[in-house]
């Protein structure tokens, strides 16, 4: 799996999970989120050569096509596979609100 | 939806469905598929700017992060959303086999 256990331990040019910490205030201007101050969002990036974690039959065919026809611009792309939620605390007036935001943290990647 | 109805009618630099016909023999070297000789596989390509068909909360946040911090290399990628199967005819010896290959044709795209 192209997850932290694999990707953060190996230097990898191919599609893999990359670390990204987002500070809500500094990076997004979101002062209204009280907790947490930021989070490990992570992201997916890297090349998708033939059979590198291909997600579907189409991405397999496309990576093979791209290998045989390297002048073609059609190739799979490295995107998130497994995502997890993030729980935040913010206020509406003086009323605290705890909310779980779905699909905020990338845990693994794939070529699609 | 970033499908043929929209993408094939508009000149679009952003993430969209792109036409791609794959000839099994010429493009993949697959002489064993008897019918069809090829098919409209299509593929997804293009930029994923802020809010362009964002798939998840993470891709929205990532595109916002990338817009505010343009020096960052973290941005969503244009990938397939809806896929359809392709039915093929091939032979095992002299015995014809009809098989449906899942997820072979891209029908629409998303930024993920």
């Amino acid at each position: 799996a192209l997850d932290a256990a694999y990707c953060f331990r190996n230097v990898q040019d191919n599609c893999c999970l990359r670390p990204l910490y987002i500070d809500f205030k500094r990076d997004l201007g979101w002062k209204w989120i009280h907790e947490p101050k930021g989070y490990n969002a992570n992201f997916c990036a890297g090349a998708c050569p033939y059979l590198w974690s291909s997600d579907t039959q189409h991405s397999r065919v496309l990576s093979l096509y791209n290998t045989i026809n390297p002048e073609a611009s059609a190739s799979p792309c490295c995107v998130s596979q497994d995502l997890e939620p993030l729980t935040i605390l913010y206020y509406i007036g003086k009323t605290p609100k705890i909310e779980q935001l779905s699909n905020m943290i990338v845990k693994s990647c794939k070529c699609s | 939806a970033l499908d043929a109805a929209y993408c094939f009618r508009n000149v679009q630099d952003n993430c969209c469905l792109r036409p791609l016909y794959i000839d099994f023999k010429r493009d993949l070297g697959w002489k064993w598929i008897h019918e069809p000789k090829g098919y409209n596989a299509n593929f997804c390509a293009g930029a994923c700017p802020y809010l362009w068909s964002s798939d998840t909360q993470h891709s929205r946040v990532l595109s916002l992060y990338n817009t505010i911090n343009p020096e960052a290399s973290a941005s969503p990628c244009c990938v397939s959303q809806d896929l359809e199967p392709l039915t093929i005819l091939y032979y095992i010896g002299k015995t014809p086999k009809i098989e449906q290959l899942s997820n072979m044709i891209v029908k629409s795209c998303k930024c993920s």
């Epitope: 997004l28 201007g29 979101w30 002062k31 209204w32 913010y90 935001l101 | 809010l51 929205r60 916002l64």
Partner: nanobody, 118 residues
Framework: EVQVVESGGGLVQPGGSLRLSCAAS????????MGWFRQAPGKQRELVAI??????TYADSVKGRFTISRDNAKNTVYLQMDTLKPEDTAVYFC?????????????WGQGTQVTVSS
């Protein structure tokens, strides 16, 4: 349902100014990311400016000419457009991206026409 309503478009001569306004629902405005986009005939929609909390970001084509600002008391975001050029002619759309709450999602206004012509 979040309402997003633009106003302030019109016809202006090259070099002139216009101020667009966009009002959004009070219940979500303070944490909404407010954006201005535009679409010229036959072109794809493009981002003009974003106001995300206290961060403002502009497309290269409008930097130094356009200013986005927000008034949280009036639940309104403004786009001050100065030194307008013919290539700024487009329909301008306001967007509210609401990341939290029951109204979470993206909301678009109907658009307001800006025409720069002599």
């Amino acid at each position: 349902e979040v309402q997003v309503v633009e106003s302030g478009g019109g016809l202006v001569q090259p070099g002139g100014s216009l101020r667009l306004s966009c009002a959004a629902s009070a219940s979500v405005f303070s944490w909404s990311v407010m954006g201005w986009f535009r679409q010229a005939p036959g072109k794809q929609r493009e981002l003009v400016a974003i106001s995300s909390g206290d961060r403002e970001t502009y497309a290269d084509s409008v930097k130094g000419r356009f200013t986005i600002s927000r008034d949280n008391a009036k639940n309104t975001v403004y786009l001050q457009m100065d030194t307008l050029k013919p290539e700024d002619t487009a329909v301008y759309f306001c967007n509210a991206y609401v990341p939290v709450g029951e109204s979470r999602g993206d909301y678009w206004g109907q658009g307001t026409q800006v025409t720069v012509s002599s």
